[in-house]
């Protein structure tokens, strides 16, 4: 059985939708799947890898590093999206192509940046982890790290930067998928918001989905235990 | 307000090594992004980079004149040094020190410039 | 390194008169940036990343181009722009500026 839920919930673009969640029902009345998981089911994909949720993660990783940073035109926010998804009158897309990115590094005029730009995170403003020297920030954004430290600037005068975040990972589902979503929408969903990054692939859905110890490697389910737990 | 102001030894004889000083105020060299660079003027002609130093002490010198030149700091002191060894009188000019940042630009300018100290190089 | 080509070397204007200098560079660049320096005193940034205008720069100061060709417009000269104008590079090292262009007031 399912219980549907449906709700008006701030979305990505600044406006209440109505949202369906879908739920299915414990045919024994108790805890949902999600809890079962939790609790140490034998659910596969947190045992081994599975197939399927490896190439979700990996179509998702793709389609992130061609994204970049939607801002509302009225300063409303700013999301991190496709350019298909982001309006070409109502905001400005973002995104470092042919020689307009940046330099990898103040170092090494030579290389320009082509993945990016990120919505609130920028080589150049993070203090911590700082891109430099030995630690440059590959030019491939599904492959930077969280950034912990912003500069101590209130504005940079970057465009990405100085907007107002709408958006941030959102772990969805006993896939493990990941979506950039408002806080709202996240939490209707029943789903894990990561205030702390910027996007998904820095974020492992499965290993909060699984829950119990986390993974020794965020990438491999290893919860072999489970196989004696249920 | 940010100021910047250069000093040095006015004259100096060729081959002797020149020190130059960067005072600077309203900003700190510890501030993460920030750098001071040095720029020259013969006078009546163009300007010149010479070196720049940023707050994580990453260096920049102009390799043509990479071998004689030293850049350095004292972040507590708000001071940037300049040394230039072996001079000559193709060192004669105006030397300007300028606060270096990259806000809202995908690169770095130069946003604020000393008023400029001379040096002239004769025997 | 990249040579930055002003050109013309010397103008002059009359008050009101639109006025257009260029900045050819020997290889394609990303962006440039313009300092106006008055006699006695040191360069003011007026424009970086091509096109956008330095705190308290006047509008009708604008830079535009791409690749290895770039220019400064004044739309309306003021006796107060008599000045010499230098385009610079920081696409790659050595930095370099151009050899300025000088702007009088006729």
């Known amino acids: 059985a399912q219980h549907v839920t449906t709700q008006l919930v701030l979305r990505n673009k600044g406006v209440y939708e109505s949202v369906k969640y879908i739920q299915q029902e414990n045919f024994w009345i108790g805890p949902s799947s999600i809890d079962l998981i939790h609790l140490g089911a034998k659910f596969s994909p947190c045992i081994r890898k599975d197939q399927q949720i490896e190439q979700l993660v990996l179509r998702e990783r793709d389609l992130e590093r061609d994204s970049g940073c939607c801002v509302q035109n009225d300063h409303s926010g700013c999301i991190q999206t496709q350019r298909k998804d982001c309006s070409e009158t109502l905001a400005t897309f973002v995104k470092w192509q042919d020689d307009t990115g940046p330099p990898m590094d103040k170092s090494d005029l030579g290389q320009k940046r082509t993945s990016g730009a990120v919505c609130h995170q920028d080589p150049r403003t993070c203090e911590e982890p700082a891109s430099s020297g030995a630690h440059i920030w590959p030019d491939d954004i599904t492959k930077w790290p969280i950034c912990t430290e912003q500069a101590k600037s209130n504005r940079t005068g970057f465009l990405h930067m100085d907007c107002q975040i709408k958006g941030r990972p959102c772990c969805i589902s006993t896939k493990g998928s990941c979506e950039i979503t408002t806080r709202e929408y996240c939490e209707f969903m029943h789903g894990y918001f990561h205030e702390e990054a910027t996007l998904c692939s820095q974020v492992h859905c499965l290993d909060k989905v699984c829950g119990l110890l986390p993974f020794l490697n965020p990438e491999v389910p290893d919860q072999f235990y489970r196989l004696w737990l249920s | 307000q940010v100021t910047l102001k250069e000093s040095g030894p006015g004259i100096l004889q060729p081959s002797q090594t020149l020190s130059l000083t960067c005072s600077f105020s309203?900003?700190?060299?510890?501030?993460?992004?920030?750098?001071v660079g040095w720029i020259r003027q013969p006078s009546g002609k163009g300007l010149e980079c010479l070196a720049h130093i940023w707050w994580d002490d990453d260096k920049y010198s102009n390799p043509a004149l990479k071998s004689r030149l030293t850049i350095s700091k004292d972040t507590s002191k708000n001071q940037v040094f300049l040394k230039i060894a072996n001079v000559d009188s193709a060192d004669t000019a105006t030397y300007f020190c300028a606060r270096i940042l990259n806000y809202g630009s995908n690169y770095w300018y130069f946003d604020v410039w000393g008023t400029g100290t001379t040096v002239t190089v004769s025997s | 390194q990249i040579v930055l080509t002003q050109s013309p070397a010397l103008m002059s204007a009359s008050p009101g008169e639109k006025v257009t200098m260029t900045c050819s560079a020997s290889s394609s660049i990303s962006y440039m940036y313009w300092y106006q320096q008055k006699p006695g005193s040191s360069p003011r940034l007026l424009i970086y990343d091509t096109s956008n205008l330095a705190s308290g720069v006047p509008v009708r100061f604008s830079g535009s181009g791409s690749g290895t060709s770039f220019s400064l417009t004044v739309s309306r000269m003021e006796a107060e722009d008599a000045a010499t104008y230098y385009c610079?590079?920081?696409?790659?090292?050595?930095?370099?500026f151009g050899a300025g262009t000088k702007l009088e007031l006729k």
């Open positions: 610079q590079q920081w696409n790659s090292y050595p930095l370099t």
């Open positions: 309203g900003f700190s060299l510890s501030t993460f992004g920030l750098g």
